[in-house]
């Protein structure tokens, strides 16, 4: 199966741990920590408010 | 001030399906993305899914992307986390949270609903 795009940590993105449990085997996501998918769902939100998606906000 | 309020939990079979629901008020509803969250006993808040301000953008964590899905009403200022195929890891506190385009965080939390999976 592909990976969905959020499963995986992006460079920029600090700091983030995958969303995929096999990526992240020890569980080690904290308060401090966001998963991919979070991050990925964040950074499309950023986004719209800045007006490159929908522009609502 | 924002208000969300959480419903739809409660104690279901394995393998079985709940609908969550979380009812937005106090400010206008497509001015915030959505997200479920949930808390299992002993662990820590955890993405579970989120909906972007229109609604056609889901995103999911892998735990329980083809299993779940969100979706937003923005005529009834409501959003849904619909779960199918549950499991007794599934089992959890339940919150849903408002982002006004924040990256390090959510404007406001409601106060989550228990959902138990039995085996």
């Known amino acids: 199966l592909p990976t969905l795009p959020w499963s995986v940590c992006q460079e920029e993105w600090g700091d983030c741990l995958p969303s995929d449990p096999d990526l992240d085997p020890v569980g080690t996501i904290t308060n401090e920590t966001k998963s991919s998918a979070e991050l990925y769902f964040l950074k499309t939100v950023l986004q719209q408010k800045d007006g490159i998606e929908d522009g609502l906000g | 001030q924002v208000q969300l309020q959480e419903s739809g939990g409660g104690l279901v079979q394995a393998g079985g399906s709940l609908t969550l629901s979380c009812a937005f008020s106090g400010r206008t509803f497509t001015h915030y993305a959505m997200a479920w969250f949930r808390q299992a006993p002993g662990k820590e808040r955890k993405f579970v899914a989120g909906v972007t301000r229109s609604g056609p953008n889901t995103y999911y964590d892998d735990s329980v992307q083809g299993r779940f899905t969100i979706s937003r009403d923005n005529a009834k200022n409501t959003v849904y986390l619909h779960m199918n195929s549950l499991k007794p890891e599934d089992t959890a506190v339940y919150y849903c949270?408002?982002?006004?385009?924040?990256?390090?965080?959510?404007?406001?939390w409601g106060q989550g609903t228990q959902v138990t999976v039995s085996s």
């Open positions: 949270a408002a982002n006004s385009g924040v990256v390090s965080g959510y404007d406001y």
